[in-house]
């Protein structure tokens, strides 16, 4: 199948369900990264940490994991925090097999999402509840704010960043007028001076098999930077694409299997079949990366209980004109490549 069974909890930021319990902060702002990324053992992904800061070697099966040190996404691993109640701070990388969960006496089916309180959205994956915060705490506004503080706002669920030197903030042009959101009752405040921003999708977290790609966008009711994620699979790990390169050619930029198949994820199966295209390989020193792509929504049906949908990278064409440097991270120098522009929508 095109997507190996693996949960989307691979990028969830672990969060406590008990709001009163203190828990260590694994992410520091601003980011502090070593000058050069680590060298990972063969077969271990070099990925961006859960803080969206530094390159790390992904944690493997049985390794400890945190919101910063995340498990290898393309090996179908997720961070099991069940042994660290009630803090849910340090977990162990575990493999998905796809069973249900019980939390506070309530049974949830594998793949089911629910909200235990206003601050977290949780998903049951293989007997373990993985949670992602609804109160996203992006980095403080570093450009203009010299004294940011994280405070609890009366009457609101989520804490907010406030700036003690608010008067120094430059006035911004109203490029995204969120009055339309306000009219629909989606927001409590009006954010009229909001510059709409959506970052490009990050490169897929792995060069073969299932990975994760993320981006930051403030195109939402609160004009608040939020992380979006999508599943990605640049090429299957178990197919030798070089065997498919035509005689006389150096590359096969796009590999497309003959038959359509269902995507599978955490034991759940897509409601329709797909015949995806994958990026291929070259025999010379070039790497193939997505060039023309889009994001599609794939609906999954689970054996027991409700289904769910996930955003998935859909590749239409790949570009093969970058030199391959680090076998673990072929996309490290992508942004500096002048002719490359992925279509990201």
């Amino acid at each position: 199948t095109a997507l190996s069974p693996t949960p989307t909890t691979m990028t969830f930021t672990p969060a406590p369900l008990e709001e009163t319990t203190t828990r260590p902060e694994f992410c520091k702002w601003p980011c502090e990264c070593p000058q050069s990324p680590p060298r990972c053992p063969l077969g271990v992904s070099l990925i961006t940490d859960g803080c969206e800061c530094c390159k790390i070697c992904a944690q493997q099966l049985g390794d400890n994991c945190t919101e910063a040190a995340i498990c290898d996404p393309h090996r179908g691993l997720y961070c099991d925090y069940s042994g660290d109640r009630p803090r849910y701070a340090i977990g162990v990388c575990a493999q998905v097999v796809g069973v249900g969960c019980v939390l506070d006496g309530v049974r949830y089916t594998n793949g089911e999402s629910f909200q235990p309180n206003c601050r977290y959205n949780c998903t049951c994956i293989d007997g373990t509840v993985g949670c992602t915060p609804l109160c996203l705490s992006p980095r403080p506004p570093r450009l203009w704010c010299r004294q940011p503080r994280h405070v609890r706002v009366p009457g609101q669920c989520c804490e907010q960043w406030v700036c003690d030197d608010d008067a120094r903030r430059p006035r911004q042009t109203a490029l995204l007028d969120t009055r339309a959101f306000a009219a629909s009752g989606a927001v409590e405040q009006r954010y009229e001076n909001c510059i709409a921003y959506t970052s490009p999708w990050s490169p897929c977290s792995t060069t073969c098999g299932l990975g994760i790609s993320t981006r930051i966008s403030n195109v939402n009711a609160r004009c608040w930077p939020e992380q979006e994620s999508r599943l990605c699979n640049l090429r299957p790990c178990d197919v030798d694409i070089q065997l498919h390169i035509k005689a006389g050619k150096k590359c096969l930029a796009v590999y497309q299997p003959e038959e359509a198949t269902n995507f599978t994820l955490a034991g759940c199966v897509s409601t329709r079949t797909y015949r995806p295209k994958y990026c291929g390989v070259c025999t010379d020193n070039r790497c193939c990366i997505p060039y023309k792509s889009k994001t599609i929504s794939v609906d999954f049906q689970c054996p027991e209980g409700p289904g769910f949908s996930r955003q998935v990278l859909w590749i239409n064409a790949c570009f093969c004109n970058l030199s391959c440097r680090n076998p673990n991270d072929i996309f490290a120098d992508l942004e500096s490549y002048p002719d490359f522009e992925e279509i990201a929508n």
Epitope: A253, V254, Q256, C282, S293, A317, F319, C320
Partner: antibody, heavy 121, light 108 residues
């Protein structure tokens, strides 16, 4: 229905450059590629260049290498063809045409109306 | 480079006639061949791809056949709107993609 609308006719001096645009509607550059074909007055069709889906790179006809640059702007679904160091032999109608991004399918499904480039002294 | 040679370079025919145009490739291209129609002052239009598949909206009086190095385009029961120049194009996986020199179908 896929439509390609090209920029207007150009008169250029010998040695100058010309940039022709081609705006796609009815589809997106995510699903197909734009290639460029030219036709000198009273002559046949001559392929110039475009994105080769199988090789994963923009390829050019030998005759035009180093002189032509083909680019695509996905945000506006517009493609461009930039031809440098024009000579009188470059006087021609320049067409953009679509190729579906499907392996082994190098057929030009839809064509722009053409842009006449005249090179004068 | 694969060279394409069309014959004849021009043909005179009447409405209702059947016209056959041939195209030879300098080396084998399997069935990777397309035929285009071009009228004066207009852009070419795709008629047939894959040597024999009719492009959408093309009348069934147009048909194509052949493989390897020898291909034909047949227009049965020629209509007034069919008087034009026809080009073959090799569409194998290797650039450059080359066209034949064209065959002009004229009114007799």
């Amino acid at each position: 229905e896929v439509q390609l609308v090209q920029s207007g006719a150009e008169v250029k001096r010998s040695g100058a450059s010309v940039k022709v645009s081609c705006k796609l509607s009815g589809d997106t550059l995510t699903d197909l590629s734009i290639h460029w074909v030219r036709q000198a007055p009273g002559k046949g069709l001559e392929w110039m260049g475009g994105f080769d889906f199988e090789d994963g790179e923009i390829v050019y006809g030998d005759k035009f290498k180093g002189r032509v640059t083909v680019t695509e702007d996905p945000s506006t679904d517009t493609a461009y063809m930039d031809l440098k160091r024009l000579t009188f032999e470059d006087t021609a109608i320049y067409y953009c045409a679509t190729i579906k991004d499907i392996p082994g399918r190098y057929y030009f499904d839809f064509w722009g109306q053409g842009t006449l480039v005249t090179v004068s002294s | 480079v694969i060279w394409m040679t069309q014959s004849p370079s021009s043909v005179s025919a009447s409405v209702g006639d059947t016209v056959t145009i041939t195209c030879r490739a300098s080396q084998g291209i399997r069935s990777w061949l397309a035929w285009y129609q071009q009228k004066p002052g207009k852009a070419p239009k795709l008629l047939i791809y894959g040597a024999s598949s009719l492009h959408s909206g093309v009348p069934s009086r147009f048909s194509g056949s052949g493989s390897g190095t020898y291909f034909t385009l047949t227009i049965s029961s020629l209509q007034p709107e069919d008087f034009a120049t026809y080009y073959c194009q090799q569409a194998d996986s290797f650039p450059p993609w080359t066209f034949g020199q064209g065959t002009k179908v004229e009114i007799k």
